[in-house]
């Protein structure tokens, strides 16, 4: 008999449901890939773009060996939050000119739900703490200029990517673990 | 400071044409998006267009479609509205704003155009 | 036809404090910033709130704006007869890829 009524499922393998958190986090990165060619290709960028209100990179190939699972999931999913953030602001308050790329910004960020949607069902079906960001999240200002919110975008895309990358290696890594 | 000067108004007949400018200084004209923004004697403000930063995305309102052209000159840092096939109900004070996000935050004083036959 | 909804007057006394409201849609207000503009009579406008409720430096904090769903809002505290004016919502709207502004509400501080 499964369990019992109101229980938590817990799943049966873990490798599985990360699995299904890899395929998710490949495929949002072959999205993320795309629209950020299609932004260089649509508004070139002049050199790299930063922004201080996106998260530091995790992960580099000098900790990928002492990853643990508990760690990079939650770092993970406070990270995507915060690009998840970006995004919405981007949609939001860019101005018209990234209007035109709205279908496919609507699609990210819903894909980005999704993913963060996932990782808070895995680290719950394994009993791992759902830890809130350090601090609260700050207000993302109006952009100074059209110009600047273009380089925002750049530097989102170009940041998210990085991460998903990253996270990628990471996941199939500590898969190999379990 | 942030000056913006529209010019090119005044009286013209229904069917026939007219080009408005706008000067910006005192700021980097070709970061900032550039809307044109109408309105009616005694009446409410409409919206006319929008141009991205660097000239290549152009919005239109439904009313103007087909007859107005949006266009800037950032070695200039002008804008222009050429407008076509002028209508009675194109009379308005025609303002051009700037743009950092979706908010005008600095507007022209105005020109006026009166389509009258 | 306005996309956006203003009523169209408004009045106080000095001192008072008054609310201008803004109706829109899901395309519109609902995934959109909303910002209010003021024009005196016979001037350009001049913009008022933006981002829903953030003040341009020079703008007094009796002016604030808010915004619920497919609604906003601007509250005018301490009347005053200068603040005597029209003004204006507006939003980007998605499904008309333009900006909308509301019809315009004209204050008239009484007294």
């Known amino acids: 008999p499964g369990p019992p009524a109101g229980s938590p499922r817990v799943s049966s393998d873990p490798r599985a449901d990360l699995d299904s958190a890899v395929l998710l986090t490949r495929s949002l990165l072959a999205d993320t890939r795309q629209l950020a060619a299609q932004m260089r290709d649509k508004f070139p960028a002049d050199g790299d773009h930063n922004l201080d209100s996106l998260p530091t990179l995790a992960m580099s190939a000098g900790t990928l060996g002492s990853l643990q699972l508990p760690g990079v999931l939650t770092r993970l999913r406070v990270d995507l939050m915060s690009y998840f953030r970006h995004v919405q602001w981007l949609r939001r308050a860019a101005g018209p000119s990234l209007k035109t790329l709205e279908p496919e910004l609507g699609a990210l960020q819903a894909r980005l739900e999704r993913l963060l949607r996932r990782l808070q069902l895995l680290m719950s079906r394994l009993a791992l703490p759902q830890a809130a960001p350090d601090q609260p999240a700050v207000p993302l200002g109006p952009p100074a200029s059209a110009w600047g919110s273009i380089r925002a975008a750049h530097a989102i895309l170009g940041g998210l990517h990085l991460t998903l990358d990253w996270a990628v290696r990471g996941l199939l890594l500590l898969k190999t673990r379990l | 400071q942030v000056q913006l000067v529209e010019s090119g108004g005044g009286v013209v007949q229904p069917g026939r044409s007219l080009r408005l400018s706008c000067a910006a200084s005192?700021?980097?004209?070709?970061?900032?998006?550039m809307h044109w923004v109408r309105q009616a004697p005694g009446k409410g403000l409409e919206w006319v267009a929008v141009?991205?930063?660097?000239?290549?995305?152009?919005f239109y309102a439904d009313s103007v479609k087909g007859r107005f052209t949006i266009s800037r000159d950032n070695s200039k840092n002008t804008l222009y509205l050429q407008m076509n096939s002028l209508r009675a109900e194109d009379t308005a004070v025609y303002y051009c704003?700037?743009?950092?996000?979706?908010?005008?935050?600095?507007w022209g004083q105005g020109t006026l155009v009166t389509v009258s036959s | 036809q306005s996309v956006l909804t203003q009523p169209p007057s408004a009045s106080g006394t000095p001192g008072q404090r008054v609310t201008i409201s803004c109706s829109g849609s899901?395309?519109?207000?609902?995934?959109?910033?909303v910002n209010w503009y003021q024009q005196l009579p016979g001037t350009a406008p001049k913009l008022l709130i933006y981002?829903?409720?953030l003040r341009p430096s020079g703008v007094p904090d009796r002016f604030s704006g808010s915004k619920s769903g497919t609604s906003a809002s601007l509250a005018i505290s301490g009347l005053r007869s200068e603040d005597e004016a029209d003004y204006y919502c507006?939003?980007?709207?998605?499904?008309?890829?333009?900006?909308?502004f509301g019809g315009g509400t004209k204050l008239t501080v009484l007294g």
């Open positions: 704003a700037r743009t950092p996000g979706f908010h005008f935050d600095y």
């Open positions: 005192g700021f980097t004209f070709s970061h900032y998006d």
């Open positions: 141009i991205s930063y660097e000239g290549s995305n152009k």
């Open positions: 899901s395309s519109n207000i609902g995934s959109n910033y």
């Open positions: 981002y829903d409720d």
């Open positions: 507006s939003a980007w709207d998605d499904s008309l890829s333009g900006v909308v």
